[in-house]
């Protein structure tokens, strides 16, 4: 990018540059029309018969440098060929010299600084590539010369450019003074400011465009070269902030439209709001959940919104004495989540009717909560109690919901307590065909033992047809019709008003081989 300090083609008034010395044959300003018929100013000099050592100087007005360290001067000029000048002597030249002088203000006068090299700094002696030929009575013909010179380094507030003629017949058609700067550039969402290079290459720190944030790593920078070009190099740039996406060739961040969101900074575009969420404003980093829908704390910001599950279905209970097996089906609505668990709440009611939360004597296997499978075994139920179990389904957002948690209830009433197992069986007498048994009366918690049931079968004969039962109201029994010398397995259970208790441990007994042995009392 070029920034113009002076362009005579654009000047609408007389230039009125200073000449020295005040003699005939000096530089003179002319006006004319350019290709577009715009009025332009030029300077001519043609003192080809000048006195030896006589120079004609032309100095521009003071030009503020505007921070430029190096300034470029593009000269357009024509130069008359000395051979085509009939009056030209040996002092005729086809070159001129360019100088500059720096100052902090417009302090030059008609006589100062002294019109010579040092204090003026020589830039170059300019020779014409194309010479103009002039024949008497005819128009001069020849190409315009264009030369660009480099001034500097400059350090003061401004400068003057000066032209020294020592015998040329020439016209300075235009002067363009400019400096080069790197234009403001936006790349990878990073804005690099317009920069005037002060050296061969200058590092320039970038800043993120509006609604962008720095990417991880070193802060973005680019190099501005002396020629006003940005050095090509990859830029670790910026990325659009949450709620914004890159637009217009990665030069700006655009707010996500309503109904879309972008949860993180970085690349990527705005996405439609996930299920059960919405964004009513532009620039959303997260979509708000619909009423009744939530995101768990651990859910990503871009996750769909979910809701607590409905209640489990079809709870089935199987009571086995003081143990209860509960089983159920998954809820119809999972709420859109995978992290489904179950929990149980329990209340117990005594036979008298008073109810309270279940006591600590109940055990739940695998546990009362955080169940991942749809079943549980409850142990330690008390007899003749009514239990109410509420089975609830939970997920990761259940804790965020307000209002009652839906549940599926099940009521279970335990039997009154049956007698304990009969285990201490004794054989009081045995013969080849019978066994006499006795046992201690068990302590029945709910009333007296009404009777007993004896279950026996020959060892090795396991089928149901080989099992025989005998009822007795006493705590003894005689088993008849047994095989000689055979082994029998015997179990006894007691019955009270609450029902039969469990069979006790199998007792191993053997009949006699022959009669001669007689009755023999045996101890188990």
């Amino acid at each position: 990018l070029e920034e113009t300090l002076l362009n005579t083609k654009l000047e609408t008034a007389d230039l009125k540059w200073v000449t020295f010395p005040q003699v005939d044959g000096q530089w003179e300003e002319l006006s004319g029309l350019d290709e577009e018929q715009h009025s332009v100013r030029t300077y001519e000099v043609c003192d080809v018969q000048r006195a030896p050592g006589q120079a004609h100087w032309l100095r521009t007005g003071w030009v503020p440098r505007r921070g430029a360290v190096h300034v470029y001067a593009t000269l357009r000029f024509t130069m008359l060929e000395c051979l085509s000048l009939p009056r030209a002597g040996r002092s005729c030249k086809e070159t001129f010299t360019v100088f500059y002088y720096e100052s902090d203000a417009d302090t030059a006068t008609a006589l100062t600084p002294a019109w010579m090299e040092n204090p003026y700094i020589k830039v170059d002696t300019v020779a014409a590539e194309h010479l103009t030929r002039k024949r008497p009575g005819a128009e001069a013909t020849g190409k315009v010369n264009v030369k660009t010179l480099r001034l500097g380094p400059l350090s003061k507030a401004g400068f003057y450019l000066a032209f020294q003629d020592q015998g040329a017949c020439m016209a300075l058609l235009s002067l363009h003074l400019f400096y080069k700067k790197c234009a403001q550039l936006t790349v990878n969402l990073t804005r690099f400011p317009e920069t005037v290079p002060r050296e061969l290459v200058v590092p320039v720190a970038g800043s993120c465009v509006v609604d962008a944030v720095p990417a991880p790593g070193p802060s973005p920078s680019l190099y501005c070269r002396e020629d006003g070009q940005w050095a090509e190099q990859p830029v670790t740039g910026c990325s659009c902030a949450p709620g914004f996406e890159a637009a217009e060739g990665n030069t700006k961040c655009r707010a996500c439209a309503q109904g879309t969101f972008k949860p993180l900074s970085g690349e990527g575009s705005c996405q439609p709001c996930p299920a059960n969420s919405h964004s009513n404003t532009i620039g959303s980093a997260v979509c708000q959940c619909r009423v009744g829908y939530f995101r768990a704390r651990t859910d990503p910001r871009g996750a769909p919104c979910t809701t607590p599950p409905s209640a489990p279905r079809s709870v089935v209970s199987r009571l086995n004495g003081s143990s209860l097996h509960l089983e159920w089906s998954a809820p119809l609505e999972s709420g859109g989540r995978e992290d489904l668990t179950y929990a149980l709440r329990c209340r117990e009611c005594r036979p008298g009717g008073s109810c309270a939360p279940c006591g600590g004597d109940l055990t739940f296997d695998p546990g009362p909560r955080d169940l991942v499978e749809p079943w549980v075994v409850v142990r330690g139920l008390r007899p003749d109690f009514t239990y109410t179990f509420e089975v609830t389904a939970l997920n990761g957002v259940s804790s965020l919901a307000t209002g009652p948690v839906p549940f599926e209830p099940v009521n279970v009433t335990t039997d009154r307590e049956v007698p304990p197992a009969v285990s201490d069986i004794r054989v009081t007498r045995s013969s080849p065909s019978s066994l006499s048994l006795a046992w201690a009366v068990p302590r029945a918690p709910s009333g007296a033992v009404l009777d007993y049931e004896v279950k026996y079968h020959e060892k090795g004969a396991e089928g149901p047809s080989s099992v025989r039962f005998l009822k007795t109201s006493e705590n003894r029994a005689e088993l008849r019709g047994l095989k000689r010398g055979a082994s029998y397995l015997v179990q006894v259970r007691a019955r009270s008003e609450a029902g039969y208790g469990p069979f006790g441990q199998e007792h191993h007994s053997q009949t006699q081989l022959d009669e001669s042995e007689g009755w023999r009392e045996q101890l188990a």
């Epitope: 007389d14 005040q22 003179e28 300003e29 002319l30 004319g32 001519e44 017949c169």
Partner: antibody
């Protein structure tokens, strides 16, 4: 001899037309920018019109724009001013004048008049 | 467009210095030329580019221009210098020429 000689002046009725001529000699006419300047009786100088050396551009004072036309014939070394729709206030001595010349580039001229003709009187009266 | 203002008349004794002014907004930024016109004659250029003197014009004629005022100075005025003097400049379009109203110089 370097000179400019105007002719064509005279008495003309308002609304009438007149054509002034200016014959140039002693210099390279086709390299020169030329102008007409007038002076009403007892008044100051008033610039009327310019023409570039190749006739590529002409300029006029607001007071004559649309009524006067400047032209030149470089082969005849002559400058012209065609005056139409003349008014009483156009009564004046009309001078042709040469602008200061470039050394060798007829696209440019200096801003002063360095050569004048003796003038021709135009009287607009009924 | 710029307007150039001159005093209608200036009187000077022979041998004295006559100064004729020409004023206009920021006139110092423009080149000013001076013309001498004697009765019944065509104008003659006496000063151009503020202060340059054409060949054939006596050295007693000089010019300056700064600020809003250009000045024609005739040192050691002679009787033959009695004439009307006009300043002129190009307008901002650089193609239109403006003249001052003229100053009648009387040599007493």
């Amino acid at each position: 001899q370097v000179q400019l000689v105007e002719s064509g002046g005279g008495l003309v009725q308002p609304g009438g037309s007149l054509r002034l001529s200016c014959a140039a000699s002693g210099f390279t006419f086709n390299n020169s920018w030329m102008s007409w300047v007038r002076q009403a009786p007892g008044k100051g100088l008033e610039w009327v019109s310019n023409i570039t050396s190749s006739s590529s551009m002409t300029h006029y004072a607001d007071s004559v724009k649309g009524r006067f036309t400047i032209s030149r014939d470089n082969s005849k070394n002559t400058l012209y001013l065609q005056m139409n729709s003349l008014r009483a206030e156009d009564t004046a001595v009309y001078y042709c004048a040469r602008k200061g010349m470039s050394f060798y580039n007829n696209k440019y001229a200096k801003s002063m008049f360095d050569l004048w003709g003796q003038g021709t009187l135009v009287t607009v009266s009924s | 467009d710029i307007e150039l203002t001159q005093p209608p008349s200036v009187s000077v004794a022979p041998g004295q210095t006559a100064r004729i002014s020409c004023s206009g907004d920021n006139l110092g930024k423009k080149y000013v030329h001076w013309y001498q016109q004697k009765p019944g004659q065509a104008p003659v250029l006496v000063i151009y580019y503020d202060s340059k003197r054409p060949s054939g014009i006596p050295e007693r004629f000089s010019g300056s221009n700064s600020g809003n005022t250009a000045t024609l100075t005739i040192s050691g005025t002679q009787a033959e210098d009695e004439a009307d003097y006009y300043c002129s400049a190009w307008t901002t379009t650089m193609m239109h020429i403006v003249f001052g109203g003229g100053t009648k110089l009387t040599v007493l």
